[in-house]
């Protein structure tokens, strides 16, 4: 079974800076799976943000401003990253990575 680890327990950033969150996959090859990122703002339901497929195709939640989030995956290190540009107060949340496995 696949196991996901987000090494950073928390990330503190100055307003307008860039935050980079990491997700490390083990127990399953990341090369063929799609990785999904979600966020949970305080007091709100969890929300899908963006996903990236095996070949670097991305899907983003329609309401998300263009250029706000950038997702990547590095199969060699079994890692996916979520970059949050121009950090603002409404970006305060818990961010989760997930994957579908057969």
């Amino acid at each position: 079974a696949g196991h996901l680890e987000q090494p950073q327990i928390s990330s503190t950033k100055t307003l307008s800076k860039t935050a980079r969150l990491e997700c490390v996959v083990s127990g399953i090859t990341i090369s063929a799976t799609s990785v999904y990122w979600y966020r949970e703002r305080p007091g709100e339901v969890i929300q899908f943000l963006v996903s990236i497929s095996y070949d670097g195709t991305v899907r983003k939640e329609s309401g998300i401003p263009s250029g706000k989030f950038e997702v990547d995956r590095i199969p060699e290190t079994s890692t996916s990253t979520l970059t949050i540009h121009n950090v603002e107060k409404q970006d305060i949340a818990t961010y989760y990575c997930a994957l579908w496995e057969v």
Epitope: T29, S31, A32, S34, S51, I52, S53, Y54, D55, G56, T57, V58, R59, K60, E70, D72, R73, I74, P75, V102
Partner: antibody, heavy 118, light 107 residues
Framework: EVQLVESGGGVVQPGKSLRLSCTAS????????MHWVRQAPGKGLDWVAV????????YYADSVKGRFTISRDNSKNTLYLQMNSLRTEDTAVYYC???????????WGQGTLVTVSS | DIVMTQTPATLSLSPGERATLSCRAS??????LAWFQQKPGQAPRLLIY???NRATGIPARFSGSGSGTDFTLTISSLEPEDFAVYYC?????????FGGGTKVEIK
């Protein structure tokens, strides 16, 4: 309607270079991984290369590694394949194809013929 | 690299008959397998993805099954337009690899 149109093929001598282009329309090009696939005359399909939506990652078949370079210009909705040190065995129809999640390779161009001959 | 082997190389059948095409992977590809149809002078067309899912607009007579290393494409009743070459492809690992193809010809 999704459309992919390849161009740049032709006859070239061994050792020379050629650059193929694939112009996309009908979808948000900048969110898709894109592939090149080739087919030698009378032969099967042969995957060549892929590039991530933002160009951050590229993978190649062993047969073209170090000689071919895949790139893209999202502002022009265009995918490229720079082919250097061409060999006779590179003679093929070259197709670009759209990536995706499960349903990848759901759209292909019409192909462009590259002939490497002295 | 994962080697994909398709059998038979050629299948001679009549319209209305059932076609069963096989694809075997040299190692497990889980269910990350696609099937394509190609007619002379045309680009390939995606039929099945992730082993058993029909692509958009593909008729129900096409079905895919299998997982791990052994996969099957079935055409329940051949139509005249189904006579073509069929390829399987794995996306479990880079580099992506295709099978050598099965030609379905009119008997």
């Amino acid at each position: 309607e999704v459309q992919l149109v390849e161009s740049g093929g032709g006859v070239v001598q061994p050792g020379k270079s050629l650059r193929l282009s694939c112009t996309a329309s009908g979808f948000t090009f900048g969110t898709y991984g894109m592939h090149w696939v080739r087919q030698a005359p009378g032969k099967g399909l042969d995957w060549v290369a892929v590039i991530w939506y933002n160009g951050s990652n590229k993978y190649y078949a062993d047969s073209v590694k170090g000689r071919f370079t895949i790139s893209r210009d999202n502002s022009k909705n265009t995918l490229y394949l720079q082919m250097n040190s061409l060999r006779t065995e590179d003679t093929a129809v070259y197709y670009c194809a759209r990536g995706g999640f499960g349903e990848s390779f759901d759209s292909w161009g019409q192909g462009t013929l590259v002939t490497v001959s002295s | 690299d994962i080697v994909m082997t398709q059998t038979p190389a050629t299948l001679s059948l009549s319209p209305g008959e059932r076609a069963t095409l096989s694809c075997r992977a040299s190692q497990s590809v889980i269910d990350y397998l696609a099937w394509f149809q190609q007619k002379p002078g045309q680009a390939p067309r995606l039929l099945i993805y992730d082993a058993s899912n029909r692509a958009t607009g593909i008729p129900a007579r096409f079905s895919g099954s299998g997982s791990g290393t052994d996969f099957t494409l079935t055409i329940s009743s051949l139509e005249p337009e189904d006579f073509a070459v069929y390829y399987c492809q794995q996306r479990s690992n880079w580099p992506l690899t295709f099978g050598g193809g099965t030609k379905v010809e009119i008997k």
